[in-house]
C-alpha cells in the first residue's frame, strides 16, 4: 500500500519538475543550495538555480537529452562544485568535489553548519520592506527563502515553502493597510517565532535519523502517530510511519525535491483514507497543498476509542509473549508502543519510548530465563517510577515558573545549567537556557493531561539544540555523554547532572562586566540577553555562589542599568557607576 511511485523515470530531474511545477522546483533548489553553501551570496545562488531550471526544462522537453538521466545528487553536486570561490570560502568543504556520488553528497551534508558565522538578520523599516516587495516580489520572496535556509540548514524544505506563502500573504495584505506597521510587524514576529520552533523540531528529527538511525526515528513516529490517531489500526499507523520516515530521511539527506513530492503524496493518501485514520482531518483536507500538509502535521489528537482493554492480557499474561518477541521483535515492540501510546496522550513521546525500552530489555532478559512468565510478570510495575519522574519534575518547575515569571525562571535555569556544564560557551548557555525557560509559558498553562507531552517533548527539542551546537566544538565530556548515550534519556541525563566539581573557575575579567550607553537603546529582549550573559559569566567566575548572592548582584546590576539609562550623561554614568558595581560585586561574591 505504499503511496510512493516506484516506477523508474528516464529523467529524475524532469520527473520532479513536472510533479512539483516550476515555482516549487525553483524554490526547493534554492533552499537546497543555500543549505549546502551557506556563505554564498544570494545572486550566485539565483544564477545556479536558473541554470538548473533551464536544464530541467530541456529534460522535460526530451527526457533522452544529454545528462538528463543523471541523478539529482550528481546534477546538483556538479553545479555546486562550479562555484569559483569554494576553497577560499569553505576551506576543506572544497575537498568534497573530488569525491564521487554518493560520497560527495555525504561530504556536503557533514559540512552543514548549525551555527554559521552570518550577521543577525536586521528587519528594515516597514516602508523600505513594502517598497522592496512591490518593486520585485519574486526576488523579495527568494531572498526570504535564501536567508532562512542558509541560517537553518536542516529547515524542513516543504514547510519553508508554506512559511514563504504566509510571508507573501502578510506583505500583500499589510502593505496596502492604513497602518502598515501595526498590520505587518505582529505577523512577522509570529512567523519568526514559529520558524525558529519549526527549525528546531526538524533539527531533532534529523539528529534522530542521523545519529541514532532509522529505527529510533520510526519508534518516535509510532508513538506520536498512535497518540494522534488512536482510532487507526496498527497496520495503518505502521504504513504512515514508513512513509513519514522516507519523507524525513529525504529532507534530512538534502533530497528536497523527492521529499516535497513524497510529502504531497502522503498528504493525499491521508486525506483519501481519513475515515480509517482520524476524525480530526476533515478541515485540513479541504485546504490547498502546503496548508494541508502543515495542518495534518499539527492536527490535534483524535479521541481515544471507548473501552480499550488492559494491555496486560496481550503483553504480560499471554502464553505467546516470548513467541511473538522471538518471531518479530520490532513488530511486537511496535505494537506494544502503539497500544501504550494510543491509551496515553497524556504522556510525552520520550516517556513512551522509555517504557517501550524497559519492556524490550525485560523481554530480552526474561525470554532466555527458565521461567519467562515468572520473570516478566511484574514488568508493568517497573513503569511507575519512569512515569513519576517527569510528572514530579514538571510539577516542581511549573510551580517555580508561576512563582518567578519567565525572565527570572530563565535566570534560575541559566544558573542551574551553567553550574552543570560551565565549559559550554556563554552564548550557547544563554540561548539554550532562555529556550528551556520558555517551557513555562508554553506548557504550564495546560491542564495536567497536556503538560507532560508539551513540556518534555519541547525540552527534547531544546536539548537537541545544545547537542548540535556542542558537537561543532565539543568542550564538555558530560554534554557529550548525555547527548550521545540515549536519545530518549537526554533530558533525564541533564536533569541528573549536579554541579561540576572538576571545573576550575574562570579568571575574573572586568571587561566582561563593562557596559555602555548602547544598552539603553536595546529592546527589552536584547537587554535581558545582556543581563543573562553577565549572569552566566558570574557563575563561571564563582560557581559556588549562592542563589542569594547572585540575586543581590543581579538586582544591583538592574538598578545600575536603570539609573544610568535615566542619567543625562549616560556614558559617564556607565563608566563611573560600572566600576563601583564591579567592585561591590567582587566583594559580595568574594572574588
Amino acid at each position: 500500500r505504499g503511496v510512493f511511485r516506484r516506477d523508474a523515470h528516464k529523467s529524475e530531474v524532469a520527473h520532479r519538475f513536472k510533479d512539483l511545477g516550476e515555482e516549487n522546483f525553483k524554490a526547493l533548489v534554492l533552499i537546497a543550495f543555500a543549505q549546502y553553501l551557506q556563505q554564498c551570496p544570494f545572486e550566485d545562488h539565483v544564477k545556479l538555480v536558473n541554470e538548473v531550471t533551464e536544464f530541467a526544462k530541456t529534460c522535460v522537453a526530451d527526457e533522452s537529452a544529454e545528462n538528463c538521466d543523471k541523478s539529482l545528487h550528481t546534477l546538483f553536486g556538479d553545479k555546486l562544485c562550479t562555484v569559483a570561490t569554494l576553497r577560499e570560502t569553505y576551506g576543506e568543504m572544497a575537498d568534497c568535489c573530488a569525491k564521487q556520488e554518493p560520497e560527495r553528497n555525504e561530504c556536503f551534508l557533514q559540512h552543514k553548519d548549525d551555527n554559521p558565522n552570518l550577521p543577525r538578520l536586521v528587519r528594515p523599516e516597514v516602508d523600505v520592506m513594502c517598497t522592496a516587495f512591490h518593486d520585485n516580489e519574486e526576488t523579495f520572496l527568494k531572498k526570504y527563502l535564501y536567508e532562512i535556509a542558509r541560517r537553518h540548514p536542516y529547515f524542513y524544505a516543504p514547510e519553508l515553502l508554506f512559511f514563504a506563502k504566509r510571508y507573501k500573504a502578510a506583505f500583500t495584505e499589510c502593505c496596502q493597510a492604513a497602518d502598515k506597521a501595526a498590520c505587518l510587524l505582529p505577523k512577522l514576529d509570529e512567523l519568526r517565532d514559529e520558524g525558529k520552533a519549526s527549525s528546531a523540531k526538524q533539527r531533532l528529527k534529523c539528529a534522530s535519523l542521523q545519529k541514532f538511525g532509522e529505527r529510533a526515528f520510526k519508534a518516535w513516529a509510532v508513538a506520536r502517530l498512535s497518540q494522534r490517531f488512536p482510532k487507526a489500526e496498527f497496520a495503518e499507523v505502521s504504513k504512515l510511519v514508513t512513509d513519514l520516515t522516507k519523507v524525513h530521511t529525504e529532507c534530512c539527506h538534502g533530497d528536497l525535491l523527492e521529499c516535497a513530492d513524497d510529502r504531497a503524496d502522503l498528504a493525499k493518501y491521508i486525506c483519501e483514507n481519513q475515515d480509517s485514520i482520524s476524525s480530526k482531518l476533515k478541515e485540513c483536507c479541504e485546504k490547498p497543498l502546503l496548508e494541508k500538509s502543515h495542518c495534518i502535521a499539527e492536527v490535534e489528537n483524535d479521541e481515544m476509542p471507548a473501552d480499550l482493554p488492559s494491555l496486560a492480557a496481550d503483553f504480560v499474561e499471554s502464553k505467546d509473549v516470548c513467541k511473538n518477541y522471538a518471531e518479530a521483535k520490532d513488530v511486537f515492540l511496535g505494537m506494544f508502543l502503539y497500544e501504550y501510546a494510543r491509551r496515553h496522550p497524556d504522556y510525552s513521546v520520550v516517556l513512551l519510548l522509555r517504557l517501550a525500552k524497559t519492556y524490550e530489555t525485560t523481554l530480552e532478559k526474561c525470554c532466555a530465563a527458565a521461567d519467562p512468565h515468572e520473570c516478566y510478570a511484574k514488568v508493568f510495575d517497573e513503569f511507575k517510577p519512569l512515569v513519576e519522574e517527569p510528572q514530579n519534575l514538571i510539577k516542581q518547575n511549573c510551580e517555580l515558573f508561576e512563582q518567578l515569571g519567565e525572565y527570572k525562571f530563565q535566570n534560575a535555569l541559566l544558573v542551574r545549567y551553567t553550574k552543570k556544564v560551565p565549559q559550554v560557551s556563554t552564548p550557547t548557555l544563554v540561548e539554550v537556557s532562555r529556550n528551556l525557560g520558555k517551557v513555562g509559558s508554553k506548557c504550564c498553562k495546560h491542564p495536567e493531561a497536556k503538560r507532560m507531552p508539551c513540556a518534555e517533548d519541547y525540552l527534547s527539542v531544546v536539548l537537541n539544540q545544545l547537542c548540535v551546537l556542542h558537537e561543532k566544538t565539543p568542550v564538555s565530556d558530560r554534554v557529550t555523554k548525555c547527548c550521545t548515550e540515549s536519545l530518549v534519556n537526554r533530558r533525564p541525563c541533564f536533569s541528573a547532572l549536579e554541579v561540576d566539581e572538576t571545573y576550575v573557575p574562570k579568571e575574573f575579567n572586568a571587561e566582561t562586566f563593562t557596559f555602555h550607553a548602547d544598552i539603553c537603546t536595546l529592546s527589552e529582549k536584547e537587554r535581558q540577553i545582556k543581563k543573562q550573559t553577565a549572569l552566566v559569566e558570574l557563575v563561571k567566575h564563582k560557581p559556588k555562589a549562592t542563589k542569594e548572592q547572585l540575586k543581590a548582584v543581579m538586582d544591583d546590576f538592574a538598578a545600575f542599568v536603570e539609573k544610568c539609562c535615566k542619567a543625562d550623561d549616560k556614558e559617564t554614568c556607565f563608566a563611573e557607576e560600572g566600576k563601583k558595581l564591579v567592585a561591590a560585586s567582587q566583594a559580595a561574591l568574594g572574588l
Epitope: 497496520a235 505502521s238 492480557a313 518471531e327 513488530v331
Partner: nanobody
C-alpha cells in the same frame, strides 16, 4: 476476552460461492492473527486460511486460488470468500483468533474459537 461468531454458511451447488463472516466482540482483534479451520464428518479439524495484523495471508494448498481471507478493521470482522466450491469443501467452518504476529497454521496455537457454521456443497 474475545468472542467469535461465524455466519454465512449454507447449502450451495458445486462451482458456486459463499462468503463466511466472523464477527469478534469483547475487544478489537486487528492486531490478532485470525484463521479459518474446517472439520468434515469423521475427519480431523484442518487449516484453511489465516491472516495477520498487516493482512499477510496464508492458505492450505487445497483452497489456494479459490478462497480469499480478508479482514475489516472498522467492523472487527474476518471474512472468507469461497469460490469454485467443490463437494469436498463440505464441513463445519470455524473462525479462530490469537494474539500472534505471525499467523499460525496449527489449531492448537489459537486461543479463541467460534461455534462454527455448516457449509454443504452438493454435486
Amino acid at each position: 476476552q474475545v468472542q467469535l461468531n461465524e455466519s454465512g454458511g449454507g447449502m450451495v451447488q458445486a462451482g458456486g460461492s459463499l462468503r463466511l463472516s466472523c464477527a469478534a466482540s469483547g475487544r478489537t482483534v486487528s492486531n490478532y492473527a485470525a484463521g479459518w479451520f474446517r472439520q468434515a464428518p469423521g475427519k480431523e479439524r484442518e487449516f484453511v486460511a489465516a491472516i495477520n495484523w498487516n493482512k499477510t495471508t496464508t492458505y492450505a494448498d487445497s483452497v489456494k486460488g479459490r478462497f480469499i481471507i480478508s479482514r475489516e478493521y472498522a467492523k472487527n470482522t474476518v471474512a472468507l470468500q469461497m469460490n469454485s466450491l467443490k463437494p469436498e469443501d463440505t464441513a463445519v467452518y470455524y473462525c479462530a483468533a490469537v494474539f500472534r504476529i505471525v499467523a499460525p497454521k496449527t489449531q492448537y496455537e489459537y486461543d479463541y474459537w467460534g461455534q462454527g457454521t455448516q457449509v454443504t456443497v452438493s454435486s
